[in-house]
């Protein structure tokens, strides 16, 4: 029986060009975490395996960094990064737990101020 629950950062926002940490935490179970997969919609971003360590998908290597912990850091954010992210915890003996995070990437306040307060 699966008793665990995934806690996530929920809905988060970040500025374009900035970075954000995607974090999930599995609680209320003694199951062994064997692997965590990170997905963005239908794309595999990264995998953290208990034996093999981290694998970052080559197409995301420039902008995705492993950690902290089992989390994932997204860098140099663009508006195209807006969307759903999933942490998929593979555990033994429970099975699979999935957490969801929604990220909204906003135009930076610097850019907004630059547009509003132009020097004549």
């Amino acid at each position: 029986m699966m008793t665990g629950t995934i806690e996530t950062t929920g809905n988060i926002s970040a500025e374009k060009g900035g970075s954000i940490i995607l974090q999930c935490h599995l609680s209320s179970t003694t199951a062994q975490v064997t692997q965590v997969n990170w997905e963005q919609q239908d794309q595999l971003l990264a995998i953290c395996n208990a034996d093999l360590g981290w694998h970052i998908s080559p197409s995301f290597k420039d902008r995705v960094a492993p950690g902290p912990g089992l989390g994932l850091t997204l860098q140099s954010l663009t508006v195209n990064d807006t969307g759903e992210y999933f942490c998929i915890y593979h555990t033994y003996p429970d099975g699979t737990y999935t957490g969801r995070i929604f990220l909204e990437v906003l135009e930076s306040s610097v850019a907004e101020h630059g547009a509003r307060f132009q020097i004549p």
Partner: antibody
Framework: EVQLLESGGGLVQPGGSLRLSCAAS????????MSWVRQAPGKGLEWVAS????????YYADSVKGRFTISRDNSKNTLYLQMNSLRAEDTAVYYC???????????WGQGTLVTVSS | DIQMTQSPSSLSASVGDRVTITCRAS??????LNWYQQKPGKAPKLLIY???SLQSGVPSRFSGSGSGTDFTLTISSLQPEDFATYYC?????????FGGGTKVEIK
């Protein structure tokens, strides 16, 4: 250099048994999930079974469930496939494959032929 | 079980041609899709993993794309050594399943 070497294939009568081995070298065997995949003569690839690294959890195709057992001996860097109650339709080349992150199969052995016939 | 349907089952092409092979899953498999090349009497060889990642040592003329249910393997300029059979495989869930294969023959 990663190497996988299967052995144990041969001719066996229907209802008989066979144990295949896959000797691994060139990598930390205990860290990787491993799989068996077979290919009947002139046919496509069919997954047979997989075994996880840390937990030893095993998974099977419906066609072999209850008859085949996948196992591993990390101290000997060897993967096994115990095949019982063999049928003519089990005739195939059997490959072992390394399965990093249980997502892809990056190295394959050369295969061993199992023929089930009377 | 997830069914993988490959098309075409065979094709004839010339050296230098651009070749496209498609693979469709019976349900969404995210990007858990791999492509293998197999030559007669040899073991399969991994070309593309996780839908679009090129395996180390594989020539860049091979590329993969797609997500969800529809995937494509493209060979940008077919070389003599590329005449072989190609298989897709899903690793989204067990049982792991392969497509029926696409045989690329010389025209």
């Amino acid at each position: 250099e990663v190497q996988l070497l299967e052995s144990g294939g041969g001719l066996v009568q229907p209802g008989g048994s066979l144990r295949l081995s896959c000797a691994a070298s060139g990598f930390t065997f205990s860290s990787y999930a491993m799989s068996w995949v077979r290919q009947a003569p002139g046919k496509g690839l069919e997954w047979v079974a997989s075994i996880k690294s840390s937990t030893g959890t095993s998974y099977y195709a419906d066609s072999v469930k209850g008859r085949f057992t996948i196992s591993r001996d990390n101290s000997k860097n060897t993967l096994y496939l115990q095949m019982n109650s063999l049928r003519a339709e089990d005739t195939a080349v059997y490959y072992c494959a390394r399965e990093p992150y249980s997502v892809w199969m990056d190295y394959w052995g050369q295969g061993t032929l199992v023929t089930v016939s009377s | 079980d997830i069914q993988m349907t490959q098309s075409p089952s065979s094709l004839s092409a010339s050296v230098g041609d651009r070749v496209t092979i498609t693979c469709r899953a019976s349900q969404s498999i995210s990007s858990y899709l791999n492509w293998y090349q197999q030559k007669p009497g040899k073991a399969p060889k991994l070309l593309i993993y996780a839908a679009s990642s090129l395996q180390s040592g594989v020539p860049s003329r091979f590329s993969g794309s797609g997500s969800g249910t529809d995937f494509t393997l493209t060979i940008s300029s077919l070389q003599p050594e590329d005449f072989a059979t190609y298989y897709c495989q899903q690793s989204y869930s067990t049982p792991l399943t392969f497509g029926g294969g696409t045989k690329v023959e010389i025209k």
